[in-house]
């Protein structure tokens, strides 16, 4: 059931009331408005909208709304100087090459400002060599290339196909694998699904179609100049050479048509499998090097990008809380885009700017939730989720104190097909209720609830008659919140369906041709899906605005721990000899793991059982609810990666986009068999289940009855 | 003071089948996730499957299709059962808790 006990209330200002207030046609008008010209991230374009975002949601009823700047590191192709990639003769012709610029789509010809594909954060440079194909440039592809088919990629400039992994963990291997540049592509494969036209007349990829996207390897440390701080006016900014994250071989992303070209000239090996092969009518040869008639030529890259400390503006918006103002529930999405951003981010940001105005409509009426609700327009996500970060860095004292929840609103649609969610364990009961409350969009599941659309197309692998929910990762704003600051986080869109089309994300993803008309002709023309999620996210927000008792069930995390424990343990014992030899444990983690799933039962028996009334109690119950999350934080953050403080989930170090489970155990046994100190390798195996174990048993702790 | 005792190893024919049983004592045999692993005649030890204390099961590829593992908490006993067996399955099967609690072993020989 809703909640609707905030002041003034009346009847009718419930969550209903709220959900009622959402309307689809508005955010077709807000993705409208959002998406005529390019946003890009430290333009003027972008404070321009920020300016009215700020001005819209005073309109629309908020307490405050401000500007938060931060003067961070951006990436730009230099105007006059455009980045390129050329096949060479022996004599140093360029024989061919690769495109400045991607044909504008029909009616944007004359619109100006749209940055060029670039791989944002590239250093300079003019490399040429023989080329490698190293597939999607993955941790595996570089094993198999170096190990298997004994092939050196120092000094030689690698090919990669964009998909299943962020591109600045691609960039990271090419690097380790000494490379001296890479070539990012889309591949038909990937980004163009069979049967569908390509863009203007369908939502696939055309052949000078480019995907941008920074290539940094931050590991969630935000401005690469100010890690841990704020970018603010009297920062201390690190040398460049200090610069966090920052790669150090130039790189270029291009379309297939450019691809083809380098491509269908390959020699060498033969790829491995058929893994290796993508749709383009070319061996997939993995080189090194053109084939016999063009063996001497090579090709050449030509980067003129520059680093530029360049201000960004986030929107703050705050509607405070009736009950407890010193309690918040952040919903935030950014901004920015790299082109139009039909899709990203401005579908999500059109959602937002509906739910702002839902709720200002509430409070005009005399409503307040509960606790206060931030909304948050965040500047400089694709170079790195810097605004996002900055701002948390900034307000990092009061968020750890304060922050019940944040939930994520980037692009709301990847795809029609069905509802997908990634969020903390605490808040699968949340979702699960308040989708079963939601009416499905759904064709065929014309008055059956979303929770049933949503678990008929996407089950749990583990528990029948329940939907699949994900793992939080990263490649999105809520990082900072969840992974440094141990706040409970969700995300929530509309996404394809992933057994029929294997492409990666969706085609035209971070191209020119992801306008306003790719949304209302092919993905969503009655905008019932982003209504949808427009419910979802809004629907989040006010429960954990609005409900007395924060609805987290600490019980599920119990559960996934269990699972989790079950999964790292299974992947320890591939390695019998040394688990022996090593007298390697888990005894800690699993009596952590019982311990905390005995207290977090007792836990939600007294949550059942208490005075609800006794506004003293209430706020403790409460307060061990917001902080389990924080208990899962180890301050000295995980190897290496100190602003991955989060024991229990950290991005994968293979895929940021990916979550990993117990990851600080993961991280030391993986490829363990190729260290060259077993005793000292698996010694860190034995310290990582150590840091797990105490850390689970510490979290349970905090759910004991305090006296 | 933990335990761990196999049994129900033998000779077998290819393409036979054999039930394994390890029965456990001196920890909640419910709270643990536990494992088999094998040690053909002259070579290391091999990981071949694992059930975690939620009954989640993984196997090694090579075993993948033809070996079952289970648990009965109620009984605290793991079973594995081999199915479509082969002449490389011939080894000692260890019941193994984790990389210090083992069993003594049992011999599986698959042969003609």
């Known amino acids: 059931k809703s909640s609707n006990e905030a002041t003034n209330i009346t009847p009718k200002h419930n969550m209903k009331a709220f959900l009622d207030e959402l309307k689809a046609e508005n955010i077709k008008k807000f993705l409208y408005n959002f998406t005529q010209i390019p946003h890009l991230a430290g333009t003027e374009q972008n404070f321009q909208l920020a300016k009215q975002i700020q001005s819209q949601w005073k309109e629309f009823g908020l307490d405050s709304v401000e500007l938060a700047h931060y003067d961070v590191l951006l990436s730009y192709p230099n105007k006059t100087h455009p980045n390129y990639i050329s096949i060479i003769n022996e004599d140093g012709n360029e024989i061919f090459n690769t495109s400045l610029f991607e044909p504008p789509p029909p009616g944007y010809e004359n619109v100006s400002d749209i940055v060029p594909p670039f791989s944002a954060f590239s250093p300079q440079g003019m490399p040429e060599g023989d080329l490698v194909y190293v597939n999607y440039a993955r941790t595996e592809d570089f094993f198999k290339l170096e190990r298997d088919m004994k092939i050196n990629c120092s000094g030689k400039i690698v090919i990669a196909r964009y998909g299943k992994v962020f591109r600045g963990n691609k960039v990271k291997n090419a690097q380790l694998a000494g490379a001296k540049g890479v070539i990012l592509y889309s591949d038909p494969a990937d980004y163009f699904a069979p049967g569908v036209k390509s863009y203007p007349d369908g939502w696939n990829l055309p052949g000078g179609g480019v995907q941008r996207g920074n290539i940094l390897n931050l590991n969630g440390a935000g401005d690469p100049l100010t890690p841990g701080y704020p970018a603010n006016e009297y920062a201390y900014r690190r040398g460049i050479a200090e610069a966090v994250g920052l790669p150090s071989i130039p790189v270029h992303p291009i379309g297939y048509y450019d691809a083809q070209k380098l491509l269908e000239k390959m020699g060498g090996s033969a790829p491995p499998d058929s893994s290796w092969r993508g749709s383009l009518k070319v061996p997939y040869n993995v080189g090194p090097g053109f084939t016999g008639n063009f063996s001497t030529q090579k090709v050449k890259m030509h980067i003129h990008s520059t680093n530029e400390v360049t201000r960004i503006y986030n929107v703050i918006g705050t509607l405070r809380g009736a009950v407890e103002p010193d309690r918040y529930v952040i919903l935030g999405g950014h901004r920015d885009s790299w082109v139009f951003g039909g899709i990203d981010p401005q579908s999500g940001a059109a959602v937002v700017h509906e739910i702002v105005r839902s709720f200002g409509t509430l409070k005009k009426e005399g409503w307040r939730p509960r606790r206060t609700i931030l909304f948050a327009s965040w500047d400089a996500e694709e170079f790195g989720l810097l605004g996002s970060t900055e701002w948390a860095e900034e307000n990092s004292r009061l968020l750890q104190e304060r922050g019940v929840a944040y939930i994520n609103a980037d692009s709301s649609i990847e795809g029609n097909y069905t509802l997908r969610v990634d969020c903390t364990p605490l808040m699968y009961s949340l979702v699960h209720n308040l989708t079963k409350e939601l009416k499905s969009p759904d064709e065929g599941f014309e008055g059956k609830s979303l929770y049933e659309s949503w678990t008929k197309k996407s089950p749990s692998p583990e528990f029948s008659g329940m939907p699949r929910i994900s793992k939080l990762g990263s490649g999105n704003d809520f990082e900072v919140f969840f992974q440094r600051l141990g706040i409970a986080s969700g995300r929530a869109r509309y996404t394809k369906n992933w057994e029929t089309n294997k492409f990666s994300g969706y085609p035209l993803y971070h191209s020119v041709y992801e306008t306003y008309e790719l949304v209302e002709k092919f993905y969503d023309p009655m905008f019932k899906y982003h209504l949808t999620v427009a419910q979802v996210r809004g629907g989040m927000v006010f429960e954990l605005a609005n409900s007395i008792v924060l609805p987290f069930d600490c019980r599920d995390y119990a559960v996934v721990l269990r699972k989790y424990a079950d999964k790292i343990y299974s992947i320890s014992m591939k390695h019998p000899q040394e688990m022996k030899t090593y007298s390697v444990s888990f005894d800690s983690l699993f009596s952590a793991v019982k311990n905390f799933t005995e207290i977090a039962s007792k836990f939600s028996e007294r949550l059942q059982d208490f005075d609800k009334s006794n506004p003293i109690v209430l706020r403790m119950m409460n307060d061990q609810l917001m902080f389990l999350e924080r208990a899962f934080i180890d301050p000295l953050g995980l190897p290496d990666r100190p602003f991955y403080r989060h024991v229990i989930y950290a991005p994968s170090s293979h895929n940021k986009y990916a979550g990993e489970s117990f990851p600080g155990i993961y991280d030391a046994l993986f490829d363990i068999e190729s260290k060259v100190d077993p005793s000292k390798a698996w010694g860190e195996v034995k310290r990582q289940i150590y840091v797990a174990a105490f850390t689970v048993q510490a979290a349970a702790e905090t759910l004991s009855e305090v006296a | 003071e933990v335990q761990l005792v196999e049994s129900g190893g033998g000779l077998v024919q290819p393409g036979g089948s054999l039930r394994l049983s390890c029965t456990v004592s001196?920890?909640?045999?419910?709270?643990?996730?536990v494992s088999w692993v094998r040690q053909a005649p002259g070579q290391g030890l091999e990981w071949v499957s694992s059930?975690?204390?939620?009954?989640?099961?993984y196997y090694a590829d090579s075993v993948k299709g033809r070996f079952t593992i289970s648990r009965d908490d109620s009984k605290d006993t793991l079973y594995l059962q081999m199915n479509s067996l082969r002449a490389e399955d011939t080894a000692v099967y260890y019941c193994?808790?984790?990389?210090?609690?083992w069993g003594q072993g049992t011999l599986v020989t698959v042969s003609s």
């Open positions: 193994a808790k984790d990389g210090v609690d």
């Open positions: 001196g920890f909640t045999f419910d709270d643990y996730a």
């Open positions: 059930i975690g204390a939620g009954g989640g099961t």
